[in-house]
Interface confidence: medium
């Protein structure tokens, strides 16, 4: 019960608070549990105890382990445990799940993202913010105190947000980063009978024999979370995978887009080396969800080669 998980990255500052609380006047002793060795309080040490706080300035992977804190008062002792894990810095942009702090949700009306654990540190503005590793730029984003405010929140704002700040200890600066996911709550989400934006019903697509052709099936299903929905192509009423023509394949286009808040899907049908017999097939773009199924049919016609003038 009185154990707390803490994590950080090597060469960054990490400050951990004892899970057992006490008055500021109470003394707190820290120990490295594996060896029962006392953690020094002298600030010249890279790892030192400062009352309720255990400071790693900076942290190293080898610091990982369980630390015991004992809050001592004249009448009682309280024991807590800090389970500390220090990870190597990632070479790529992805932040693994084990480095993520709790997910926060926002909406058009409320879009504050607090920088996790920042209250433990001695930091000064500016607080830098990144989304999916890209520095946030533009008037919609405002770093305010220890949180980020996003104006006019859109579905595209969902993602992983990293705050970066500098901790100052006795004139020395240490970098700290923390990442959490932000989800956007759809306050007026809805689902509707699929609407196919492309192709048009009974569209005729001109193709050249021997060339490649692409057909895109694009449909929207509503706004916000769509529970069960799909777009796919059929040839003469048969699924592409069952039709058995390796020249004709379907692949996801933009697997989910939320332009204007609408939830849409694309499926691209790729026909390699168009043949005469392809002109005889019926191509059906299907969009389906729990409301039902909508079908738009396309046929191919031969494109007349452009006549050149001599």
């Amino acid at each position: 019960k009185f154990s707390k998980q803490s994590w950080g990255l090597e060469n960054e500052a990490l400050i951990v608070r004892c899970p057992r609380q006490g008055k500021p006047s109470y003394t707190v002793d820290w120990y490295y549990s594996q060896t029962n060795k006392s953690i020094p309080t002298q600030e010249r040490n890279r790892v030192f105890a400062s009352g309720q706080l255990l400071k790693f300035l900076p942290a190293a992977v080898a610091d990982s382990g369980i630390y015991t804190c004992i809050v001592r008062s004249p009448t009682f002792n309280r024991t807590g445990y800090a389970n500390v894990t220090i990870y190597k810095k990632q070479s790529d942009c992805n932040v693994p799940d084990y480095l993520m702090y709790s997910t926060v949700s926002g909406s058009e009306k409320n879009s504050k993202i607090y920088c996790p654990t920042i209250d433990l540190y001695n930091w000064t503005a500016p607080l830098e913010w990144f989304k999916n590793c890209q520095a946030l730029q533009g008037s919609r984003y405002r770093a305010h105190k220890s949180f980020l405010v996003i104006d006019n929140v859109m579905t595209e704002d969902a993602g992983d947000y990293t705050c970066k700040f500098i901790h100052n200890e006795n004139g020395a600066n240490y970098s700290v980063t923390a990442t959490r996911s932000f989800t956007v709550k759809d306050e007026q989400g809805f689902s509707l009978f699929p609407v196919i934006g492309a192709p048009a019903q009974n569209e005729i697509k001109e193709v050249e024999i021997g060339k490649n052709a692409n057909l895109t099936c694009s449909a929207c299903f509503g706004k916000g979370t769509q529970f069960l929905a799909a777009v796919l192509w059929q040839l003469n009423g048969t699924k592409i995978t069952d039709f058995g023509e390796p020249r004709i394949q379907q692949e996801e286009g933009q697997n989910q887009s939320f332009s204007n808040g609408l939830a849409c899907l694309d499926m691209v049908l790729r026909i390699a080396d168009v043949k005469e017999e392809d002109l005889l097939l019926q191509y059906d773009c299907l969009a389906l969800n729990l409301h039902g199924l909508r079908r738009h049919t396309v046929r191919l016609s031969r494109k007349n080669p452009s006549k050149e003038c001599f």
Epitope: V184, Q226, A229, L288, N289, L290
Partner: nanobody, 116 residues
């Protein structure tokens, strides 16, 4: 997920799973994992179809509520071999209906224990 718990053999439980976030889920399903065993598919639902593992056919029923973005698994005539951790999964990529690798969003799991 929610709805798990302990029950006597022959009893019933109803699991539920709420989908959230800005996603379009092509299909959703229930998987289970017994201690020391591989994760296995139990029941799957897409927009137009449902499918069940042979071991649960006739006893389990999958349903969905699009208004609540929720998937349910009604489990009747439970047997001790149904014991395990039950996971709700969403597939947002085209793939194989019964392969856990083709589901890219997983719930935390809910424990179901059936005693004889």
């Amino acid at each position: 997920e929610s709805g798990g718990g302990s029950v006597q053999a022959g009893g019933s439980l109803r699991l539920s799973c709420a989908a959230s976030g800005y996603t379009i889920n092509y299909r959703m399903g229930w998987f289970r994992q017994a201690p020391g065993k591989e994760r296995e598919g139990v029941a799957m639902a897409s927009a137009i179809s449902e499918d069940y593992a042979d071991s649960v056919k006739g006893r389990f029923s999958i349903s969905r509520d699009s208004a609540k973005n929720t998937l349910y698994l009604q489990m009747n005539s439970l047997k001790p071999e149904d014991t395990g951790m039950y996971y709700c999964a969403a597939g947002r990529v085209w793939g194989r209906l019964w392969n856990p690798d083709d589901y890219n969003s997983w719930g935390q799991g809910t424990q179901v224990t059936v005693s004889s």
